[in-house]
């Protein structure tokens, strides 16, 4: 009696199940009580000796090529012996790598939680996935994995970690690059300070007296309020950032405590008030002010 | 098939601006870097900067700084280079390149776009 | 600012023998990350310039294999092994390693 080994399907992709079936065309495995035993190359596969004549592999890999064969074994025991089959595994090459973050849209708080997922739409076996940071790439990262996803953290972002990234993904075919992707660091302004500049030391009556606010930190656009006593002067925006000044034609009601704040949608601060006095040096016709 | 396509010849009057584009089509115009050279006539190549169309932020040569501004229309996939104040020695033919990052080379150029400055 | 000086600056071939062409960096141009971006370009005539070599030894796809770059540090080298008639125009070398990016003055390569 002659035993053939029969592998379903014969040319595998990785990852997928196989079928072993030891096959006897002139005897029928129910005439005798047979054995099947399932060898690799030089090796016993799965429980050894076993009245199946069928063996399922979940998953074959590309470590998984070789040389295959069967026994079959009667009662009687004799032994029969198929011929060798090459099974080849056949890898997919990555493809269509792409990298995405989260928070989606690449923004983030200053601070917050930074993930950038590096994803391939498809590739088999152990996947290199690289993450590099600037168009000139710093490798931040490698992992190797199982899988057509892999994840890098920054736990807590930095201003200094908006810039260009991009990853790669690589399974023995050759490196592929994901796009770019730009992260935004999204910084809360910082509390104000507020400048009062006067044209002379001693400004008068009908001086043109300049408020100057500024957050030294913060991402733009920043918009500034001015008050005075808690009474809103006006506003002025600082699109690109950086500070922002408010005119004021100063009458003897402009005495007290001035203020300002910055607000960039991510929080507001306030700055310390300046206060604003009237005085009248001797000998002087007109009024004076002094901060 | 990834293309840069880029406008037609100029002549300016020195002290004029000139605004060059660059309109990509054939791959994701948000994925990779555009970088801008130029070359005067007879002459060698000349980096000027570039710009990430992703999120429109430019990096300039400074010898360029305050002259030239790099910018990008995601909506139309196309990329500027505007350069101000002109002078004779600026005329040149102006390239736009994408450039591959990982591998880092410039893959595909525009056919080149030639400014001339003259009175 | 890094220059990149080339030399011969002009090269009068002869098809089928070889040529080599010289490439010097003003200073190291290996960047933090370890890598060396040094790319050779030829530039045709009336076309604009086309990839050869990147990253000082790789042959982009489609480049055939009588052209191989080699070096290191500052120093760097441009060989065609067998050069043919439609190797004939403008060779440059570039780094991107140091901003500003800069281009050698281009060695020119002609038929005898």
């Known amino acids: 009696a002659e035993l053939f080994l029969i592998a379903s399907p014969s040319h595998p992709t990785e990852g997928s199940p196989v079928t072993l079936t030891c096959k006897m065309p002139f005897l029928q495995s129910s005439d005798a009580q047979f054995q099947f035993c399932f060898f690799r190359d030089t090796r016993a596969l799965g429980p050894g000796w076993s009245s199946s004549p069928k063996l399922q592999i979940a998953a074959m890999w590309k470590e998984d090529t070789g040389s295959y064969w069967c026994e079959a074994q009667t009662m009687a025991s004799k032994v029969l012996r198929s011929r060798r089959s090459q099974i080849n595994v056949h890898r997919v090459p990555v493809a269509d790598v792409s990298l995405e973050t989260q928070p989606p849209g690449g923004q983030v708080m200053e601070g917050d939680r930074l993930v950038l997922i590096c994803s391939v739409a498809m590739g088999t076996g152990d996947i290199t996935f690289l993450w590099y940071k600037g168009a000139v790439g710093l490798n931040l990262q490698s992992k190797t994995q199982r899988s057509l996803t892999a994840e890098y953290e920054i736990p807590s972002v930095r201003e200094s970690d908006a810039e260009q990234y991009y990853c790669v993904a690589e399974n023995g075919y050759g490196p592929s690059p994901s796009g770019l992707v730009s992260i935004t660091v999204r910084i809360p302004v910082s509390r104000p300070i507020l400048m009062l500049r006067a044209p002379r030391a001693q400004a008068a009556v009908e001086d043109v007296l300049e408020l100057h606010c500024e957050a030294l930190r913060g991402s733009p656009p920043i918009l500034y309020w001015f008050y005075h006593e808690d009474i809103t002067l006006g506003s002025r925006s600082a699109p690109s950032g950086g500070g922002a000044s408010f005119n004021l034609s100063l009458t003897e009601e402009h005495s007290g405590n001035y203020s300002c704040e910055a607000n960039n949608g991510l929080g507001a601060q306030r700055s310390e008030a300046v206060t604003l006095n009237f005085t009248v040096p001797t000998g002087a016709r007109s009024n004076h002010l002094t901060s | 098939q990834v293309q840069l396509v880029q406008s037609g010849a100029e002549v300016k009057k020195p002290g004029a601006s000139v605004k060059v584009s660059c309109k990509a089509s054939?791959?994701?115009?948000?994925?990779?870097?555009i970088h801008w050279v130029r070359q005067a006539p007879g002459q060698g190549l000349e980096w000027m900067g570039w710009?990430?169309?992703?999120?429109?932020?430019?990096k300039y040569n400074e010898k360029f700084k305050g002259r030239v501004t790099i910018t990008a229309d995601t909506s139309t996939s196309t990329a500027y280079m505007e350069l101000s104040s002109l002078r004779s020695e600026d005329t040149a033919v102006y390239y736009c390149a994408r450039r591959i990052h990982y591998y880092d080379y410039f893959d595909y150029w525009g056919q080149g776009t030639l400014v001339t400055v003259s009175s | 600012d890094i220059v990149m000086t080339q030399s011969p600056l002009s090269l009068p071939v002869t098809p089928g023998e070889p040529a080599s062409i010289s490439c010097r960096s003003s200073q190291s141009i290996v960047h933090s990350n370890g890598n060396t971006y040094l790319e050779w370009y030829l530039q045709k005539p009336g076309q604009s310039p086309q990839l050869l070599i990147y990253k000082v030894s790789n042959r982009f796809s489609g480049v055939p294999d009588r052209f191989s770059g080699s070096g290191s540090g500052t120093d760097f080298t441009l060989k065609i092994s067998r050069v043919e008639a439609e190797d004939v125009g403008v060779y440059y070398c570039f780094q991107g390693s140091h901003v500003p990016w800069t281009f050698g003055q281009g060695t020119k390569v002609e038929i005898k």
């Open positions: 054939g791959y994701t115009f948000t994925s990779y870097n």
């Open positions: 710009i990430y169309p992703g999120d429109g932020n430019p």
